[in-house]
Interface confidence: low
């Protein structure tokens, strides 16, 4: 599992995302905040795509989820897969692209603020061997059983975005995890590319809000591709 890998701390010898880009096993670990990144390989084109090993959804980009690449495949071999768009089949929320959630096996828009009335329903769905299952919650003793009814405000400790109030997401914040605001138009966002840029984010931004996507700032002319700012922009 991810935890056992982390605990062994063979950080510099790990495959991506924990040890930097593929082919750069000595890449430094960017710890506070940020991604484990090697710098130069941060923004690679899709042409250079290589399957991205992962152990849980948080290791993948905001537009991806962690799963076995083959249906019924070896659960031990998981990679980051592109998120499912609206009306596509799903088994859990993380499979659906930002702004959507998994309901009755289909990715649907989260416009209706579904967590208010449907959290009990969705949480008890059978998601298989997944961190989002009810069993997954029962092992976390830090949360009370009332957590579904009292949504975390900005800065509250959380486990996942469903713990947070509307307009907030649950994101890593240094060595904790708290509710943070979903990004608005013009705000800097984190654009994950396919190779060498994922990883355990110690400081994690929320995703862009409804109708926005994370794209390179048009007027941001910089010498290096890797240092271009990404901001939330209208589709």
């Amino acid at each position: 599992t991810l935890n056992s890998v982390l605990n062994s701390n063979a950080i510099k010898n790990l495959p991506p995302p924990l040890g930097g880009a593929a082919g750069h096993p000595g890449s430094a670990v960017s710890a506070a905040p940020g991604i484990l990144y090697p710098g130069g390989n941060k923004y690679q084109t899709i042409d250079n795509y290589q399957p991205y090993p992962c152990a849980e959804d948080e290791e993948c980009g905001t537009d991806e989820y962690c799963a076995s690449p083959t249906r019924g495949g070896d659960a031990g071999v998981q990679i980051c897969l592109a998120c499912r768009k609206r009306r596509k089949r799903c088994m859990r929320h993380a499979m659906c692209c930002p702004g959507n959630y998994c309901k009755n096996g289909i990715c649907v828009s989260s416009d209706q603020n579904h967590f208010r009335g449907e959290i009990e329903e969705t949480i008890t769905e059978s998601f298989g061997n997944d961190h989002s299952t009810l069993d997954g919650y029962s092992r976390r003793t830090t949360l009370s059983s009332k957590m579904y009814h009292t949504k975390g405000q900005e800065g509250s400790v959380c486990l996942r975005s469903s713990d947070c109030a509307s307009g907030l997401c649950c994101a890593r914040h240094f060595w904790s995890k708290i509710c943070k605001p979903v990004l608005k138009e013009g705000q800097v966002c984190t654009k994950h590319r396919r190779k060498g840029s994922h990883g355990l984010e110690i400081f994690q931004r929320c995703y862009c809000g409804e109708g926005l996507s994370c794209r390179i700032q048009k007027d941001h002319h910089q010498a290096s591709n890797s240092s271009r700012l990404h901001t939330c922009q209208r589709h």
């Epitope: 991810l2 935890n3 982390l6 605990n7 701390n9 950080i11 430094a28 670990v29 960017s30 710890a31 506070a32 905040p33 940020g34 991604i35 990144y37 941060k42 976390r140 830090t142 900005e154 800065g155 400790v157 914040h173 240094f174 060595w175 904790s176 995890k177 708290i178 943070k180 800097v188 355990l200 400081f203 931004r205 240092s227």
Partner: antibody, heavy 122, light 112 residues
């Protein structure tokens, strides 16, 4: 008030083990990452290990990797450092420190214990 | 690993006079999120370290305003506008941009 109290230090022979504890009080321990930092006699500070708020993520300095294990028990508000295969160069004062943060800032290590002394000698 | 260096390694100051300590990192501490993860600590004799400055220039709560931090990239400075007797000790800079976190060797400040 916010307080960290280390214990478990002592004199130990090379190759033996020791377990340090750090008792936290005055804050919500389970919401904070925690560090161990050491200081050899007359020397500077050396970061040893860090553990995330829930114990899922752990990182170590190369000098202790494979020998030391950081862990925590949030129900007891206690941080631990299990030190195995101790060497003379592990002799130091060991401090636990809180990984402080606010919504917009990371404070580094904002609260420190008084330290506990570990002496590795034959 | 990021190597932190400090100059001078020792400093003798007259009370009421200013003091300045330099800290350099082997690579930039500017993170892609726009923040710079450089900290200053003071360790008074017989005590644990205490946080003075976080993220280059922010004074931690309770730290007197005679302490100030500045710098960017790889070069940083801690200034004490008017040194007082209670400021004696060893000053350390630390980076937390990258694991492992690393400290400078320390600058010992005493009173003339």
């Amino acid at each position: 008030q916010v307080q960290l109290v280390e214990s478990g230090g002592g004199v130990v022979q090379p190759g033996r083990s020791l377990r340090l504890s750090c008792a936290a009080s005055g804050f919500t321990f389970s919401s904070y990452g925690m560090h161990w930092v050491r200081q050899a006699p007359g020397k500077g500070l050396e970061w040893v290990a860090v553990i995330s708020y829930d114990g899922s993520d752990k990182y170590y300095a190369d000098s202790v990797k494979g020998r030391f294990t950081i862990s925590r028990d949030n129900s007891k508000n206690t941080l631990y450092l299990q030190m195995n295969s101790l060497r003379a160069e592990d002799t130091a004062v060991y401090y636990c420190a809180r990984a402080g943060y606010s919504l917009y800032y990371y404070y580094g290590m904002d609260v420190w214990g008084q330290g506990t002394t570990v002496t590795v000698s034959s | 690993d990021i190597v932190m260096t400090q100059t001078p390694l020792s400093l003798s100051v007259t009370p009421g006079q200013p003091a300045s300590i330099s800290c350099k990192s082997s690579q930039s501490l500017l993170h892609s999120d726009g923040k710079t993860y450089l900290y200053w600590y003071l360790q008074k004799p017989g005590q644990p370290p205490q946080l003075l400055i976080y993220e280059v220039s922010n004074r931690f709560s309770g730290v007197p305003d005679r302490f100030s931090g500045s710098g960017s990239g790889t070069d940083f400075t801690l200034k004490i506008s008017r040194v007082e007797a209670e400021d004696v000790g060893v000053y350390y800079c630390m980076q937390s941009k990258q694991l492992p976190f690393t400290f400078g060797p320390g600058t010992k400040v005493d009173i003339k």
